[in-house]
Amino acid sequence: NENSEQKENVEKEGLCNACTWRQNTKSSRIEAIKIQILSKLRLETAPNISKDVIRQLLPKAPPLRELIDQYDVQRDDSSDGSLEDDDYHATTETIITMPTESDFLMQVDGKPKCCFFKFSSKIQYNKVVKAQLWIYLRPVETPTTVFVQILRLIKPMKDGTRYTGIRSLKLDMNPGTGIWQSIDVKTVLQNWLKQPESNLGIEIKALDENGHDLAVTFPGPGEDGLNPFLEVKVTDTPKRSRR
C-alpha cells in the first residue's frame, strides 16, 4: 500500500503539472494579447483609469444604453437584442467614436472648437451602413425653436471661408430635460474615409431664438457624458455558407 500511495502522489503531481502548464500557457497568451493591444494603442503600459473616470467619459445617449443591453445579452435570456444578421449572414457592428483634439481645430479663432474624430481601421467607406452624429442640447426654460447647424471645417479659401455646411435642422424644444438629437453624417464620413486629408473636423451650433448655443460641445460641471459622439454601423462581408 506504500507503493500505491506513492503511485497516487505521482499521478496527482502529474495532473498538477499539467494544470500549471495550462495555466501558464493561458497567462502568457493573455499577456501577449495585452502587449498587442498596447502596441496598437501606442502605449507602453496599461492606462490607469478608474471606473469613475470611465463612467464620466462614456456617452449617456440611447445608443450606449442599447449597446450595453445588447452586449450583456449573453448573461441573460430576457432580452431580444443581438448582433443584427441579414439573410446572407452579414453582421453589423456598432462603433461609438468619441471626439479627440486636433491641432488644426485648436488654432481656429485661437480657441478650441468641437469636434475632430479619428476613425478605427474597422470603419471602411464601403462598409458604412449608417453614421449618426449625436449631440446633446441643454434644457430650455421656455418653449423655443432651435436651429441646429453642423459645419465641416475646410482649408481656408481665398475669401477666408473656413466652413461648409453639412446639415441644418429646425426643432422645437419644450422646458424640461435636455434632449439627445442625432444627425445623419454617412456621406460626410464616407468622404472622410476616402480622403482622410479632408477630415479637418466639424463645428456644431444649436442656437435658440435668443441666439444662445444649447449644444454641449465641451461639457461643463454636471455634464459628464454629454459630449457629442459618432455612432457608426459597419457591416462585414456577407458569408452565404455560414449556417
Epitope: R55, P62, R65, D80, W180, Q181
Partner: antibody, heavy 119, light 110 residues
Framework: QVTLKESGPVLVKPTETLTLTCTVS????????ISWVRQAPGKGLEWVGI???????YYASWAKKRLTISKDTSKNQVVLTMTNMDPVDTATYYC?????????????WGQGTLVTVSS | DIVMTQSPATLSLSPGERATLSCTSS????????LSWFQQKPGQPPKLLIY???TLAYGVPSRFSGSGSGTDFTLTISSLQPEDAATYYC??????????FGQGTKVEIK
C-alpha cells in the same frame, strides 16, 4: 407640447390578446427609447419592456413569451401586444419616454390606461 | 431574478423632519449608478426625481437628494413638506436589457 398618451381596450377577456398604443407628440421616436411599465391596483410599478430608438426590443423575463413591442415612427406610435391575458395582468399600463434607471429616462409619462382582465 | 428591496415599507414623519428611504438591489446595478428614484401620488403617473443615483432631475426641489453606489442606495428628503406625501420607487438597470423597480416606500405626513 411634448406628450405621451396610451389608448386601447378597457376590458379584455382571459386568453385574449391585448393591444395598447402609445401615441407621442413632440418626440422623435427615431431618437428616443420608449418604455412600458404597468401597475396592478394598489401595487407597485413593474417594468414590462422597451423599444429602443433603433427599434430593438428588450422585455421583462416574465413577459418575454407573450409580449411584442413595435413602433411606427411615421405615425408617432408605439404598440404593445400581449397575448394570453390573465386576470393577474389587470393593471394600469404606462408608456414613458426613455428608460427608467438610465440617464434621465422616465422624465415624461403618459397618464396610463387601466386594463381589466375578466370574463 | 433581480430583487430590489425598499425599506421601510411606510414612513410616517412630521413636516420639517428628515426622511431617509433605502433601496437595496440583489445585484449591482450597471456601472454602479444606473439607478433612479420616482415619486408617485395616487391617480398620477410616476415623476422622476433622481437619476444616475444622485443627479437631481430638472425642476425637482433641492430638498431631495440621492446617494449610494452598486447595490445600496438612499433617497433623502432633508425637510419634509406636506406635498411630499407619496409613494417613492427606486428603479435599477443591469445591462442585458434587464430593469427592475423596488416595491415602493409610502411616505405619510403626520
Amino acid at each position: 407640447q411634448v406628450t405621451l398618451k396610451e389608448s386601447g381596450p378597457v376590458l379584455v377577456k382571459p386568453t385574449e390578446t391585448l393591444t395598447l398604443t402609445c401615441t407621442v407628440s413632440g418626440i422623435d421616436l427615431s431618437h428616443t427609447d420608449i418604455s412600458w411599465v404597468r401597475q396592478a391596483p394598489g401595487k407597485g410599478l413593474e417594468w414590462v419592456g422597451i423599444i429602443s430608438y433603433a427599434g430593438k426590443t428588450y422585455y421583462a423575463s416574465w413577459a418575454k413569451k407573450r409580449l411584442t413591442i413595435s413602433k411606427d415612427t411615421s405615425k408617432n406610435q408605439v404598440v404593445l401586444t400581449m397575448t394570453n391575458m390573465d386576470p393577474v395582468d389587470t393593471a394600469t399600463y404606462y408608456c414613458a419616454r426613455g428608460v427608467p434607471a438610465y440617464s434621465h429616462g422616465g422624465d415624461l409619462w403618459g397618464q396610463g390606461t387601466l386594463v381589466t382582465v375578466s370574463s | 431574478d433581480i430583487v430590489m428591496t425598499q425599506s421601510p415599507a411606510t414612513l410616517s414623519l412630521s413636516p420639517g423632519e428628515r426622511a431617509t428611504l433605502s433601496c437595496t438591489s440583489s445585484q449591482s446595478v450597471y456601472h454602479a449608478n444606473w439607478l433612479s428614484w420616482f415619486q408617485q401620488k395616487p391617480g398620477q403617473p410616476p415623476k422622476l426625481l433622481i437619476y444616475w443615483a444622485s443627479t437631481l432631475a430638472y425642476g425637482v426641489p433641492s430638498r431631495f437628494s440621492g446617494s449610494g453606489s452598486g447595490t445600496d442606495f438612499t433617497l433623502t428628503i432633508s425637510s419634509l413638506q406636506p406635498e411630499d406625501a407619496a409613494t417613492y420607487y427606486c428603479a435599477g438597470g443591469y445591462g442585458g436589457g434587464r430593469y427592475a423597480f423596488g416595491q415602493g416606500t409610502k411616505v405619510e405626513i403626520k
